[in-house]
Each structure stands twice: as C-alpha cells, then as structure tokens.
Amino acid sequence: APTSSSTKETQEQLDQLLLDLQVLLKGVNDYKNSKLSRMLTFKFYMPKKVTELKHLQCLEEELKPLEEVLNLAQGKNSHGGNTRESISNINVTVLKLKGSETFMCEYDETVTIVEFLNRWITFCQSIISASSS
C-alpha cells in the first residue's frame, strides 16, 4: 500500500506537472495571430483514455514534437529557455509518475496543441482531486 509520504510525493509531482503544462498553455495563448494560426495546424496524438498515471507514457511520447512546435513559435533566435525548461521538467516528472510498467499507447485522435495541453491539464486536475478526496 502507498505510504503517506509517497502519496504526498506523487501529489507534489502532479502539482509540478500541472504547473508546467499551464505555463506552456499560457505561452501558446500569448502568441500573435499569425503564429498561433500556424501552431494550430500542427496535430498531436491523444490516447483513447487518460485515467491512470501509466497513461502519462502517451504524454512522454509527444514531448519531442511538442518542444519542436513550441520552439518554432517562440522564434528560433530567442533561446526558448522557458519552453526547454518546462519540457525538461515535464519529462522528469512524467518519468517519476508513470512508473516502470511498460504501457502501449493506443492513439485515438489528433488534436491541436491547445486541446492537447488542455486535456493533459484536465487529467492532472482529476487525479489531484481524486487523490485529495
């Protein structure tokens, strides 16, 4: 059974993941029209269901294209520090949260970057609220 300390650690990691995803979404929503319209043509894969921590494997698999697209929009001349830092944080946190069990993602649909980030934010929020109730 999970100890209170491991539950607390998981909670903190979910809070961190939620925060990093929100930072990325805020950045996307701040782009000017021409950049945002281009960004919205990129598609990201969403799995059939995201209800358990092991499903974070599916987020991990999309981090490389996500970083590419965010760097494009940020402008290749700016060093993309915020994006890189957030993606790196997400990568580390996801590795901790998803556990060692291998999970094969079954992708159901493609969505825009805004929808992609929103869905993973919702996932974090639902796990956080379930574990705190």
Partner: antibody, heavy 121, light 108 residues
Framework: QVQLVESGGGLVKPGRSLRLSCAAS????????MSWVRQAPGKGLEWVAM????????YYTDSVSGRFTISRDNSKTTLFLQMDSLRTEDTAVYYC??????????????WGQGTLVTVSS | DIQMTQSPSSLSASIGDRVTIPCQAS??????LSWYQQKPGKAPKPLIF???DLETGVPSRFSGSGSGTDFALTISSLRPDDFATYYC??????????FGHGTKLEIK
C-alpha cells in the same frame, strides 16, 4: 539539425516520367507540411505542390495539376514527387522544402540543395 | 492568383550602403510575406517571415517591414556577402503560393 536531401533528377524525354525523392532528417517529419518548389534555369522560384502532415491534403500549381503527384512515406521520413507526361517547360532545379506548419498558411523555413530535372528530346 | 511585383529587377549599391528592396502584392495579404536570399548555384535562404520576423541566425542588419500590399526588405549596411538575388513570397492565398520575380543586388 534539419536536413533535406533530394534525389532522382536527371535527363528525360518529353512525355516520359520521373520520380523525385527527398530524405528528411533532424525533425519530426510526420508533423510538418512539405512542398516542392522549382526554379527553371536563370528564372525565379515557382511553388509546385504541397502535402499536409498526414498526406490527407495535396495541392498543386495549375501547370502541373493532373500530371504531377506529391506523396509522402512518414515511416521512412521521405517526400516524393511523381512527374508524368513531362514537358520541356518542366526543366528546372526541384527543391524539397519544409513549412513550419502541419497544413495551411506557412512559408518555407528549410530547403534542400535541389535536384536538376532536364526534359529534352 | 495574387501577383507579387518586385521592382527594380536589379539594384546597384556599394559596401556600407543602406538598401531597401520593395515588394508589392496585387491584393491584401496581411503580413503573410517572407523574404529569401539566393546566391548562384545555391538553394534560397530564408531571411524574414510574417513580414518582419527575422529567421534563425540572420544578421540584424536585415529587417522587413510592411503589411497589406506594400512590403520592403532593408539591409542597413551592406556587406560583401549580401550581394545576391532577393525574392519575396506570399503565403496568404493558400495554397496558391506565389513568389516575386526577384531583385538582383549588384556591386556598384
């Protein structure tokens, strides 16, 4: 780093066919729209064809529509241009180019080195 | 299709000069315009996108301006490496992308 390497160009007689390939590396190929742009000797640039990230949409300039077919193999990160019923006016250097978008409004941010197609009898 | 007019077709200038290369669209293209530099035997190199945003690694002496139908590429102080042909390109009339015929920048 992003690399686009074209191949398949050469000398061909009018009415014949040729297939150009473009091997892409250094980026997540299956997320980006790709195009072919050509340049006749001593002339300006002309957009030829475009394909969306998943191959679902293809677009052509009027002069090649019905003769050229753009396609892609995302598993092999390769772009193709099948050119049929070639005409002398198709003689040009053909560039493989990437757009920083999955589809829709976009410029060209990376270009290959080009492959020369010469159509002559 | 939208026509892109680049006039003059050639331009002579000296090292250190400030040079402006105009480009005109036949109809409103918002800021959906890019600029490319091409040297003989080489592929075009992207310089500017969205009318005024500088591409990766492009020196700050290059700048783009304009919106709607009238655009310009400015080189603030010409260097020997800048002598080349410059093309503007509209990507507003999707997917009928069109390029200008180019302006060749030559040494005076």
């Amino acid at each position: 780093q992003v690399q686009l390497v074209e191949s398949g160009g050469g000398l061909v007689k009018p009415g014949r066919s040729l297939r150009l390939s473009c091997a892409a590396s250094g980026f997540t190929f299956n997320r980006y729209a790709m195009s072919w742009v050509r340049q006749a000797p001593g002339k300006g640039l002309e957009w030829v064809a475009m394909i969306s990230f998943d191959g679902g949409n293809q677009y052509y300039t009027d002069s090649v529509s019905g003769r050229f077919t753009i396609s892609r193999d995302n598993s092999k990160t390769t772009l193709f241009l099948q050119m049929d019923s070639l005409r002398t006016e198709d003689t040009a250097v053909y560039y493989c180019v990437r757009s920083p978008a999955g589809d829709w409004v976009a410029y060209f941010d990376y270009w290959g080195q080009g492959t020369l197609v010469t159509v002559s009898s | 299709d939208i026509q892109m007019t680049q006039s003059p077709s050639s331009l002579s200038a000296s090292i250190g000069d400030r040079v402006t290369i105009p480009c005109q669209a036949s109809e409103d293209i918002s800021n959906h315009l890019s600029w490319y530099q091409q040297k003989p035997g080489k592929a075009p190199k992207p310089l500017i996108f969205d009318a005024s945003d500088l591409e990766t690694g492009v020196p700050s002496r290059f700048s783009g301006s304009g919106s709607g139908t009238d655009f310009a590429l400015t080189i603030s102080s010409l260097r020997p490496d800048d002598f080349a042909t410059y093309y503007c390109h509209q990507y507003h009339d999707y997917p009928s992308y069109t390029f200008g015929h180019g302006t060749k920048l030559e040494i005076k």
